[in-house]
Interface confidence: low
């Protein structure tokens, strides 16, 4: 969570002289309350935009827009504080619109925008617009908040942003998984154009259950340049356990741009009697970068084995 680096932050518009300042998220009207305070914003609109930084990186930003109510309190409006809270970390970033001239009523409703909060993929944010000065203690609140979920890197618009590309979003492994005789799975996927190793995480589940009955991890060494974009085939030996029939195969790459934090791709094989995957399966969660929710594992012995080769 940060501000877009090189942009001159402008909030002036016809009929209003305004400047944007960094804020500590604690306006001094909290400390020195005023008797007369403005009403809250009428509407807040938030959408996702993509902007370029001064280094030429494409980054996702929040476009925040709000309007004023058409009441006399705009005569006491001295500015606004914009606050963005990243919900999972409680990290907060604020800026302050400081009005250098008095607002007057005009023929259109006053409208303000700000598009400089750089956000992360797949994160939820709470955006608050607080009119200034803030109300006295026990006064009517004069802010509005709205939550916004930034799409993950699967989203077409996000896929081309720098944080997503550096996480490996442009790699499409096109995973195929087929069940072979003798309790084996054949996993095939397309290698990326980088000499880096991969890891296949196999988690098996009983029919209609989310407690695993088998787990196996298999390393694939870095391919040679002539193998880039070729298919890699791996045969995994399953545990011979009746009913342990639903298999989630997850491929974790270790690209140089994201190392242990690269996007993973999954494919699932359903139990024979189940035509569709009944529900999403929690991600396997190794130490280096858990990606989503977890579930408990059953007490078991993992004796899986595997072979692999690159297919030209």
């Amino acid at each position: 969570l940060r501000l877009l680096d090189h942009r001159a932050l402008v909030c002036s518009q016809p009929g209003l002289n305004c400047t944007v300042k960094n804020s500590t998220c604690l306006d001094d009207s909290w400390i020195h309350p005023r008797n007369l305070t403005p009403s809250s914003p009428k509407n807040i609109y938030i959408n996702l935009s993509v902007s370029s930084t001064q280094h030429g990186e494409l980054v996702p930003v929040l476009h925040v827009e709000w309007t004023l109510q058409t009441d006399a309190s705009i005569l006491y409006l001295e500015g606004a504080e914009l606050s963005v809270l990243q919900l999972n970390t409680n990290e907060r970033l604020c800026v302050r619109f400081e009005f250098l001239s008095k607002l007057r009523h005009h023929h259109r409703r006053w409208r303000f925008t700000f598009s400089h909060f750089v956000v992360d993929p797949d994160q939820e944010y709470e955006v608050t617009v607080h009119h200034l000065p803030k109300p006295i203690p026990d006064g009517d609140p004069n802010h509005q908040s709205k939550n916004f979920l930034v799409p993950d890197c699967e989203h077409a618009r996000m896929k081309v942003t720098t944080p997503c590309m550096s996480s490996g979003s442009l790699w499409d492994p096109n995973i195929t998984v087929e069940t072979l005789e003798a309790h084996q799975l054949r996993v095939s996927f397309t290698l990326w154009n980088e000499s880096t190793h991969y890891q296949i995480l196999l988690t098996s589940f009983p029919h209609m259950e989310n407690h695993s009955c088998f787990e196996h991890m298999h390393h694939i060494p870095a391919p040679r340049p002539e193998e880039f974009h070729q298919r890699s085939n791996v045969t995994l030996t399953l545990r011979n356990l009746k009913g342990c029939c639903r298999h989630q195969v997850q491929i974790q790459p270790f690209f140089s741009s994201c190392l242990n934090d690269c996007l993973r791709h999954s494919a699932t094989v359903s139990c024979p009697e189940m035509p569709d995957t009944p529900e999403p399966i929690p991600d396997y969660m190794p130490l280096w970068e858990p990606r989503s929710g977890s579930s408990d594992y059953k007490d078991d012995d993992d004796k899986g084995s595997s072979h692999h080769h690159h297919h030209h």
């Epitope: 990243q86 999972n88 970390t89 990290e91 992360d120 797949d122 994160q123 190793h197 890891q199 787990e215 196996h216 991890m217 390393h219 270790f254 741009s257 994201c258 190392l259 242990n260 934090d261 396997y284 969660m285 190794p286 130490l287 280096w288 970068e289 858990p290 990606r291 977890s294 408990d296 594992y297 059953k298 007490d299 078991d300 012995d301 993992d302 899986g304």
Partner: antibody, heavy 118, light 107 residues
Framework: EVQLVESGGGLVQPGGSLRLSCAAS????????MNWVRQAPGKGLEWVSF????????YYADSVKGRFTISRDNAKNSLYLQMNSLRDEDTAVYYC???????????WGQGTTVTVSS | DIQMTQSPSSLSASVGDRVTITCRAS??????LAWYQQKPGKFPELLIY???TLQSGVPSRFSGSGSGTDFTLTISSLQPEDVATYYC?????????FGPGTKVDIK
Amino acid sequence: EVQLVESGGGLVQPGGSLRLSCAASGFTFSSYSMNWVRQAPGKGLEWVSFISARSSTIYYADSVKGRFTISRDNAKNSLYLQMNSLRDEDTAVYYCARPKVGGGMDVWGQGTTVTVSS
Amino acid sequence: DIQMTQSPSSLSASVGDRVTITCRASQGISNYLAWYQQKPGKFPELLIYAASTLQSGVPSRFSGSGSGTDFTLTISSLQPEDVATYYCQKYNRAPFTFGPGTKVDIK
């Protein structure tokens, strides 16, 4: 050279607070998950907390949940541990440690000592 | 939560002896297990990851084996510089628990 340097340890009274820092250098800090691990005098290693590369996943040991907060500033190549409501049993050497690609923790700091005593 | 136990808690062996330390998980953890060596007054050092993969720079006399719930660290020929405490650690999911440690010294 890949390096982690902890700081911020010291003597604090029970119920007090401390903030530990870990400065990383020699590697792309923003690409790595990080951990805090501690070791009480004469005792074994105890994993304390984990934060993923983009702070999207955070875990704590039950013994510190609700009292300790892990955070990071990728722009400053720094990892933090805010420790509140400290207890005698929090007395330990605190290490920050980087996970290895493939598993385990391959880079450790020298540790910073926290002593909780009245 | 999954518990990690180690045995023995301490051992004394002669230089050149084969030393075996075991680590047991209360539930299956596949091969998501690491072994560390910690010398007195020093920070821990990674020896083995993925249960059996030797960390680069670690002498080949160290080896790891096991999968599921039972794991072994073996020092094929004990050297004076191997005097240390050895810890196993699971890392399949949080909490990333360490075993209680095994102290190794020379007879």
